[in-house]
Interface confidence: low
């Protein structure tokens, strides 16, 4: 057999036995002659150095460049490859010799004690136990212990080769402490030497640098970088660092194993790089590489070295932030600086503290922005070493998509008396104000009653054929008033009104307001009835604990069977062709109420009394009447709002005043509450009595003292009282100057 590439000028050495494999018996003599074209050498098993005493290599007597290898009384251990080669070349001829020794079928190692096999617990890796055979066709199995297990070649991943040994997936014997090969010859068992199994790990799970990023120092400071490698068990790790200034004299490297919890399936290694006093040349990329032999993992971090501490705002720092109500707003403080600055946020000059709605840190986060968050936010950066300060102002503008105030107040099914003039209102609050408010309409019957147009509980108007109010053909005559602007509850609102000249047909009206961040709409069910009429006695909006009556009046000649109901909270599941308006269709959503009937000359009147009205009494009340002729049911709906009782409060303070004799004092005391409180004034804790100089106006809200005198000086108290209690504010009026003598004196 030939090894290597033939050269142009040299033929391969030629062996006297022209075979790849030679099988001879033990105790016989092995002799092979090798001839070539230049100086030759022999290599043989077990002793590659050529100093084996049993082996004799002699020059041939009959020619140059010829050597004969002779081994008398060969033994099984002489099995192996015999190689004749030209010195200092790759050109060689090889013959594999099996010395059949049935008493010792395995070739013993040099030490003849035991061998070591190193394995990794990798599913895909195989290991070779080098139990070579002196016989090529042995039946060899592998024994592993403890516990004892035997592995037999399976023609696949488990195999034995006399020239190589026993091959087996490494994980199969990773449990074992030792293994050996066993051959059966004529019912006799022969064993190879023992091989100790050493499980060697290789897997590195990760390499972590700490600090991992954003490392900044100034010249002269100490840099400490920790590199931690986490590995599987039975792993050894070599660390290697790469860094900018490799000739650093103050560099120190310490490697050590870290303790892990007992039973842990992992090992930890730590390498610490320390540079005592960094210079600008130490700035750059630091890379830590951990190697287990079979695997290398790296991690890098950039170290920035500054000449001295500093702080400045980054170029991306915003000056205007726009947001829509409800959004999460994030205003990052973008800065350049070392060390990281202390960051303090202020709103309109007042420091901001973090709470559940706002987080004031590197990033100012407002969880759900509201209008009151509008304003100027100042961020102040302070360098903790140099105390240098930098400030920047960010204006936050919060936009509000159109909100229609009446949307939550008006009943979705109010009814209107036939022929009356009605005004529908949409009060819109939006920032910026709406750039338009448009009105649309459509006939009530167009919006439903088609089986294919079934409505749903949460969207009672699935109609899409809205018409502009300019086109009121077939509907009610309409006029849209010019938008008004009003300050309502301290907010600038846009009020759009639609006047229906005569309520002739039932329709739906929709106002739609649009601004730059959104749209809002309100659908008004304008259900026109010729039927009964509802009035409230004594007041449109009763306060808690007051009594109120709902009067349902119907023409006796037209209607009968008047009944009061209250609209319940659980609507019907809507099926084909059903509509929530008119309410009459869904009587099962109504609760029948007790009422009192009496009559006048033309009408039947059904009165429903609410004694001591409570907030639970709020809701939609339905009066049902039946047409005497057609038996058709007519419904009228009225929404009842019960005002909550509120104890008196006085808005604004009375200010202490200093006034000169003869001047006038005018003060006002505005009180709110439900029921509305009575206002009284006191001077020095005594009721203030009106006279020519003391005037009380607007239900005692405004106090005027004309041509003040010295005796008007004192403590003035405004007190607002109702059944729910009193509220008061006080102020001291000082009167300066001398009292002029009057003629009377």
């Amino acid at each position: 057999a030939s090894v290597g590439l033939p050269s142009v000028s040299l033929d391969l050495p030629r062996l006297s036995i022209q075979k790849d494999i030679l099988t001879i018996k033990a105790n016989t003599t092995l002799q092979i002659t090798c001839r070539g074209q230049r100086d030759l050498d022999w290599l043989w098993p077990n002793n590659q150095s050529g100093s084996e005493q049993r082996v004799e290599v002699t020059e041939c007597s009959d020619g140059l460049f010829c050597k004969t290898l002779t081994i008398p009384k060969v033994i099984g251990n002489d099995t192996g490859a015999y190689k004749c080669f030209y010195r200092e070349t790759d050109l060689a001829s090889v013959i594999y010799v099996y010395v059949q020794d049935y008493r010792s079928p395995f070739i013993a190692s040099v030490s003849d004690q035991h061998g070591v096999v190193y394995i990794t617990e990798n599913k895909n890796k195989t290991v070779v136990i080098p139990c070579l055979g002196s016989i090529s066709n042995l039946n060899v199995s592998l024994c592993a212990r403890y516990p004892e297990k035997r592995f037999v070649p399976d023609g696949n991943r488990i195999s034995w080769d006399s020239k190589k040994g026993f091959t087996i997936p490494s994980y199969m014997i990773s449990y074992a402490g030792m293994v050996f090969c066993e051959a059966k010859i004529n019912d006799e068992s022969y064993q190879s030497i023992m091989y100790i199994v050493v499980v060697v790990g290789y897997r590195i799970y990760d390499v972590v640098l700490s600090p991992s990023h954003g490392i900044e120092l100034s010249v002269g400071e100490k840099l400490v970088l920790n590199c931690t490698a986490r590995t599987e068990l039975n792993v050894g790790i070599d660390f290697n660092w790469e860094y900018p200034s490799s000739k650093h004299q103050h560099k120190k490297l310490v490697n050590r194993d870290l303790k892990t919890q007992s039973g842990s399936e992992m090992k930890k290694f730590l390498s610490t790089l320390t540079i005592d006093g960094v210079t600008r040349s130490d700035q750059g990329l630091y890379t830590c590489a951990a190697s287990s032999g079979l695997m290398t993992k790296k991690n890098s971090t950039f170290v920035r070295v500054h000449e001295k501490p500093f702080v400045a705002f980054g170029s991306g720092m915003e000056s205007l932030v726009e947001a829509t109500v409800g959004e999460r707003v994030r205003i990052p403080a973008k800065y350049l600086g070392y060390p990281p600055p202390e960051i303090k946020w202020y709103k309109n000059g007042i420091p901001l503290e973090s709470n559940h709605t706002i987080k004031a840190g590197h990033v100012l986060t407002i969880m759900e922005v509201s209008e009151r968050d509008t304003g100027n936010y100042t961020v102040i950066l302070t360098n903790p070493i140099s105390k240098e300060k930098q400030s920047h102002v960010v204006s936050l503008v919060v936009y509000v998509p159109p909100q229609i105030g009446e949307k939550s107040l008006i009943s979705p099914v109010d009814s209107y008396q036939y022929g009356t003039t009605q005004t529908l209102t949409c009060t819109v609050y939006a920032i910026p104000p709406p750039h338009h408010i448009h009105w649309y309409w459509q006939l009530e019957e167009e919006c439903a009653n088609e089986p294919s147009q079934a409505v749903s509980v949460t969207n009672p108007y699935p109609c899409e054929e809205w018409r502009s109010v300019e086109d009121f053909q077939g509907g009610n005559k309409i006029e849209v008033n010019k938008n008004q602007f009003a300050l309502i509850e301290g907010k600038n609102k846009t009020v759009s009104t639609l006047v229906i000249q005569a309520a002739n047909v039932s329709a739906l009206y929709k106002c739609e307001a649009v601004n730059k961040v959104g749209r809002g709409e309100r659908v008004i069910s304008f259900h026109v009835t010729r039927g009964p009429e509802i009035t409230l006695q004594p007041d449109m909006q009763p306060t808690e604990q007051e009594s109120v009556s709902l009067w349902c009046t119907a023409d006796r000649s037209t209607f009968e069977n008047l009944t009061w109901y209250k609209l319940g909270p659980q609507p019907l599941p809507i099926h084909v062709g059903e509509l929530p308006t008119p309410v009459c269709k869904n009587l099962d959503t109504l609760w029948k109420l007790n009422a009192t009937m009496f009559s006048n000359s033309t009408n039947d009147i059904l009165i429903m009394e609410l004694k001591n009205a409570s907030l639970q009494d709020q809701g939609d009340y339905v009066c049902l009447a039946q047409d005497r002729k057609t038996k058709k049911r007519h419904c009228v709906v009225r929404q009842l709002t019960v005002l909550e009782r509120v104890a008196p409060t006085i808005t604004g303070n009375l200010e202490n005043q200093t006034t000169s004799i003869g001047e006038s004092i005018e003060v006002s005391c505005t009180a709110s509450g439900n029921p509305p409180p009575q206002i009284m004034w006191f001077k020095d804790n005594e009721t203030l009595v009106e006279d020519s100089g003391i005037v009380l106006k607007d239900g005692n809200r405004n106090l005027t003292i004309r041509r003040v005198r010295k005796e008007d000086e004192g403590l003035y108290t405004c007190q607002a009282c109702s059944v729910l209690g009193c509220a008061k504010v006080e102020a001291f009026f000082i009167i300066e100057g001398a009292q002029e003598k009057t003629n009377l004196e």
């Epitope: 294919s452 509980v457 609507p571 099926h575 084909v576």
Partner: antibody, heavy 113, light 111 residues
Framework: EVQLVESGGGLVKPGGSLRLSCAAS????????MNWVRQAPGKGLEWVSS????????YYADSLKGRFTISRDNAKNSLYLQMNSLRAEDTAVYYC??????WGQGTLVTVSS | QSALTQPRSVSASPGQSVTISCTGT?????????VSWYQQHPGKAPKLMIY???NRPSGVSNRFSGSKSGNTASLSISGLQAEDEADYYC???????????FGGGTKLTVL
């Protein structure tokens, strides 16, 4: 044209679970109440469950409460029925219906060991 | 046991008329004008024929009509045709805990 297509039926062992889906098209899904109705082999129609357009109002047949859950995803125009602890008597063709005016072709659920 | 009672089967010859009844209580058929009728051919999905007692969806022949008296609703089919052979189910809104209830179904055979 209104189209309702059920899917998710199949063979399941007693005690097992299935999730039926109904893909809707050809109408404004988010405006309509939706229903599941079933029909056991050779038997009549049995109302199973209803859900309003915004999922605010949900109703189940008394015999199924606690085992079946109806839900919908208006963004995906889809109706669902999650069926747990299935029994042999739940074997049926399950129909999805829009307000009982439009029906799908049904999906067969077989509960058998 | 269905809450609404229907005859199991009815039959008539082509051209004749037939009426299918659906009996409930004051909590369902008698209490609400929400009675519907469905036609179902074998292997097919049900089809709405009548809603709210007597209303016909577009596309349904005027040979089909619905009515109600007290607690009983009726479906009438005039001028019977072979394609009318099918199962017919009634349903009603009900004020019990389940809002919908079906009848047991009636098999209509056209002789």
């Amino acid at each position: 044209e209104v189209q309702l297509v059920e899917s998710g039926g199949g063979l399941v062992k007693p005690g097992g679970s299935l999730r039926l889906s109904c893909a809707a098209s050809g109408f404004t899904f988010s405006s309509y109440s939706m229903n599941w109705v079933r029909q056991a082999p050779g038997k009549g129609l049995e109302w199973v469950s209803s859900i309003s357009s915004g999922s605010s109002y949900i109703y189940y047949a008394d015999s199924l409460k606690g085992r079946f859950t109806i839900s919908r995803d208006n963004a995906k125009n889809s109706l669902y029925l999650q069926m747990n602890s299935l029994r042999a008597e739940d074997t049926a063709v399950y129909y999805c219906a829009r307000d009982f005016g439009n029906w799908g072709q049904g999906t067969l659920v077989t509960v058998s060991s | 046991q269905s809450a609404l009672t229907q005859p199991r089967s009815v039959s008539a010859s082509p051209g004749q008329s037939v009426t299918i009844s659906c009996t409930g209580t004051s909590s369902d058929v008698g209490g609400y004008d929400y009675v519907s009728w469905y036609q179902q051919h074998p292997g097919k999905a049900p089809k709405l024929m009548i809603y709210e007692v007597s209303n016909r969806p577009s596309g349904v022949s005027n040979r089909f009509s619905g009515s109600k008296s007290g607690n009983t609703a009726s479906l009438s089919i005039s001028g019977l045709q072979a394609e009318d052979e099918a199962d017919y189910y009634c349903s009603s809104y009900t004020s019990t805990s389940s809002p919908v209830v079906f009848g047991g179904g009636t098999k209509l055979t056209v002789l």
